[in-house]
């Protein structure tokens, strides 16, 4: 009779035996035979599987280095990585997170848009006609104008995307 | 409820072809491997094929080697068995039972089973 | 392809008796056997999967046990509704195969 070609997709063939995986958070000790089941350990302390596999090695825990800015958002178990972030005002400079730099400011003329978080940086947008910004700032979006009508003053000079509006005493009609 | 209903069993005549759909509810099909088993007239119970949760590994009894093939549609739900070549011994109830893994927390190794299965569809190979 | 061979292949007993089916399969397959119960014009219906364990729902007095070649399916104390037939099935390896079947019949 012919071995068999395919297995479940909790099997694994080897030997013309369609043997178990190993469960997550365990690794392969000796594959199964007619008689024998397959053998699995748990992985030990940092480190771990996080699939259905016949790995005769657990990988170990990502170690989230403080030199590049790096510290533990979640702490890894015998099934799961250990995923890092980056410490305050500093994000990511990919998705899987091996180095930080710090979050860039908006300059003056630019507000925020998006507050930079651990793994995505700010984003900046000029400020539109009416909005300005005079600072360089990672938390400061575009301020309005201020508005001289509700303050019973009249513009006086005229605001840019990068300074607000200079407000005066409206002139006195001579009688 | 979780419930399985076999479909587009009838009379073929020898050598024809008939496509049996298997129409999975109250539950995620795509995340169960399947099978198809028949039972001829008043015999035991006999393995068909089988389809992975993607559809991408397949396996069949020799009996039908070459001329049945499974397939399934995940967005619809769906299972099928497209029979081709069909024959008098090919005359039987077919099923479409649902192949589930049983977990083991203690870390033993876990076990199969066929444990949801359709009330059958009649296929009836005669001239 | 693995063999199964069930014996008996039919069986007369009567309610409160103690049954046991046996399975023995042509090569090792470990603990991968699960048995069936049917009755006529209905789906087979899991009772045991991994050689010994219980599927959920399914009373008590059911039971199986053994390991590679040789297994077991007993009812310790049959009652009026476990009248049917039995498959054992090994999900070792492909071609799935079944056992003939064990008819229990009522005394």
């Known amino acids: 009779p012919e071995p068999p070609t395919a297995c479940r997709e909790k099997q694994y063939l080897i030997n013309s035996q369609c043997c178990s995986l190993c469960q997550p958070g365990q690794k392969l000790v000796s594959d199964c035979t007619e008689f024998t089941e397959t053998e699995c350990l748990p992985c030990g302390e940092s480190e771990f599987l996080d699939t259905w596999n016949r790995e005769t090695h657990c990988h170990q825990h990502k170690y989230c280095d403080p030199n590049l800015g790096l510290r533990v958002q979640q702490k890894g178990t015998s099934e799961t990585d250990t995923i890092c972030t980056c410490e305050e005002g500093w994000h990511c400079t990919s998705e899987a997170c091996e180095s930080c730099v710090l979050h860039r400011s908006c300059s003056p003329g630019f507000g925020v848009k998006q507050i930079a978080t651990g793994v995505s940086d700010t984003i900046c947008e000029p400020c539109p006609v009416g909005f300005f910004s005079n600072v360089s700032s990672a938390f400061e979006k575009c301020h309005p104008w201020t508005s001289c009508e509700t303050k019973d003053l009249v513009v006086q000079q005229a605001g840019t995307n990068k300074t607000d509006v200079v407000c005066g005493p409206q002139d006195r009609l001579r009688a | 409820e979780v419930q399985l209903l076999e479909s587009g069993g009838g009379l073929v005549r020898p050598g024809g072809s008939l496509r049996l759909s298997c129409a999975a509810s109250?539950?995620?099909?795509?995340?169960?491997?399947m099978n198809w088993v028949r039972q001829a007239p008043g015999k035991g119970l006999e393995w068909v094929s089988y389809i992975s949760s993607s559809g991408e590994t397949t396996d069949y009894a020799d009996s039908v080697k070459g001329r049945f093939t499974v397939s399934r549609d995940n967005s619809k739900n769906l299972l099928y068995l497209q029979m081709n070549s069909l024959r008098a011994e090919d005359t039987a109830v077919y099923y479409c039972?649902?192949?589930?893994?049983?977990?083991?927390?203690?870390?033993?190794?876990?076990?199969?089973?066929?444990?949801?299965w359709g009330q059958g569809t009649m296929v009836t190979v005669s001239s | 392809d693995i063999q199964l061979t069930q014996s008996p292949s039919s069986l007369t007993a009567s309610v409160g008796d103690r049954v046991t089916i046996t399975c023995r399969s042509s090569q090792g397959i470990r603990s991968s056997l699960a048995w069936y119960q049917q009755k006529p014009g209905k789906p087979p219906k899991l009772l045991i999967y991994g050689a010994s364990s219980l599927e959920g729902g399914v009373p008590s007095r059911f039971s199986g046990s053994g390991s590679g070649t040789d297994f077991t399916l007993t009812i310790s104390s049959l009652q009026p509704e476990d009248f049917a037939t039995y498959y054992c099935q090994q999900l070792n390896s492909f071609p799935s195969t079944f056992g003939q079947g064990t008819k229990l019949e009522i005394k």
């Open positions: 039972a649902r192949d589930v893994f049983f977990f083991s927390p203690s870390g033993d190794n876990g076990a199969y089973g066929m444990d949801v």
């Open positions: 109250g539950f995620t099909f795509g995340s169960y491997e």
